[in-house]
């Protein structure tokens, strides 16, 4: 499995962000596919569970991401993206996307460095 992410993402406090993660695999996508999203905070604290997908999407039942994350992927299109709502400044950090698609071997975990800012920089307005 090979994973592709946007690497760096800047988003405005209070808005929603799509954390894009796509993948390729020599094995067909089926019921064995799993996607795990985790979060490493900037302060170096323990990694946190964000989201899990296996046949169905599953939000965390506890913690900072409870009721703030949803599935925005499409496995048939090799898309494992999620939506993170109501961004806060302490959402700053690294989000990891891990895709397993047996019998394909696990690949390198994808990473997105999210920066939550007060206002978007002018140079990035055309991306919105």
């Amino acid at each position: 499995v090979e994973i592709y992410t946007s690497r760096v993402l800047e988003a405005v406090n209070g808005t929603d962000a799509r954390l894009k993660c796509t993948f390729s695999s020599f094995a067909p996508v089926g019921d064995a596919l799993t996607v795990t999203w985790n979060f490493r905070p900037l302060d170096g604290g323990p990694e946190q569970f964000v989201f899990y997908y296996h046949i169905d999407p599953f939000q965390p039942m506890s913690g900072r991401f409870k009721d703030r994350v949803s599935w925005d992927g499409n496995p048939e299109r090799y898309d494992a993206s999620i939506l993170l709502w109501k961004l806060q400044f302490d959402d700053n950090g690294t989000y990891t996307c891990q895709v397993k698609n047996p019998p394909d071997v696990d690949g390198v975990i994808g990473e997105i460095r999210l920066s939550v800012v007060h206002t978007v920089r002018f140079s990035e307005i055309h991306f919105l």
Partner: antibody
């Protein structure tokens, strides 16, 4: 490194109250919800509930409402479990634990013994 | 509440053995956690969300499953693996634990 240090063992009489503390260090206290788990002697694990240290919001498991109260003091990065009107069946080890990718970090446990 | 039933409840095995513990849920759950507990100690996480190894856990431990049936496998038992193992679901509130599987030296 992350540490959760709980207060020492308690021996209480039925009807009394007890307050167990859990002092957190090595991480940002408000970033992780604190959970409480009970283990009666020789028995399995039972999730009691959780508290959000940021705003004090709580979620209690059925069976742990009324006599059980979770609280936090952010200024000293400490969570508390208070049990009132103690009964013999409250005799157990009480653990605090934080949810990260799982219940990854645990206190050493506090044995509360209720006996007349 | 979702009930988790582990089998077996007790298991005798020898160093080097391959061991599998099963956890069955009363209704479908999305993922499973596994913990190891030694006498007088707090539980230690082994597996999170079904198949991911917790930090510092040796690769001889693995998890799998879906729906109502999940398994924890230890590929080659080591002396330090003799303990009690618990499964836990948290894809539905409240989180619940299995009754435990005590793994003893044969």
């Amino acid at each position: 490194q992350v540490q959760l240090v709980q207060s020492g063992s308690e021996l209480k009489k039925p009807g009394a109250s007890v307050k167990v503390s859990c002092k957190a260090s090595g991480y940002t206290f408000t970033n992780y919800w604190m959970h409480w788990v009970r283990q009666a002697p020789g028995q399995g694990l039972e999730w009691m509930g959780e508290i959000n240290p940021t705003n004090g919001g709580t979620d209690y498991n059925e069976g742990f409402t009324g006599r059980f109260v979770f609280s936090v003091d952010k200024s000293v990065s400490t969570a508390y479990l208070q049990i009132s009107s103690l009964k013999a069946e409250d005799t157990a080890v009480y653990y605090c634990t934080i949810y990260t990718t799982a219940l990854d970090y645990w206190g050493q446990g506090t044995l509360v013994t209720v006996s007349s | 509440d979702i009930q988790l039933t582990q089998s077996p409840s007790f298991l005798s095995a020898s160093v080097g053995d391959r061991v599998t513990i099963t956890c069955r849920a009363s209704s479908s759950v999305g993922y499973m956690y596994w913990y190891q507990q030694k006498p007088g100690k707090a539980p230690k996480p082994l597996i999170y969300v079904t198949s991911n190894l917790a930090s510092g856990v040796p690769s001889r431990f693995s998890g799998s499953g879906s729906g109502t049936e999940y398994t924890l496998t230890i590929s080659s038992l080591q002396p330090e693996d003799f303990a009690t193992y618990y499964c836990q679901q948290w894809s539905s509130n409240p989180p619940t634990f299995g009754q435990g599987t005590k793994l003893e030296i044969k």
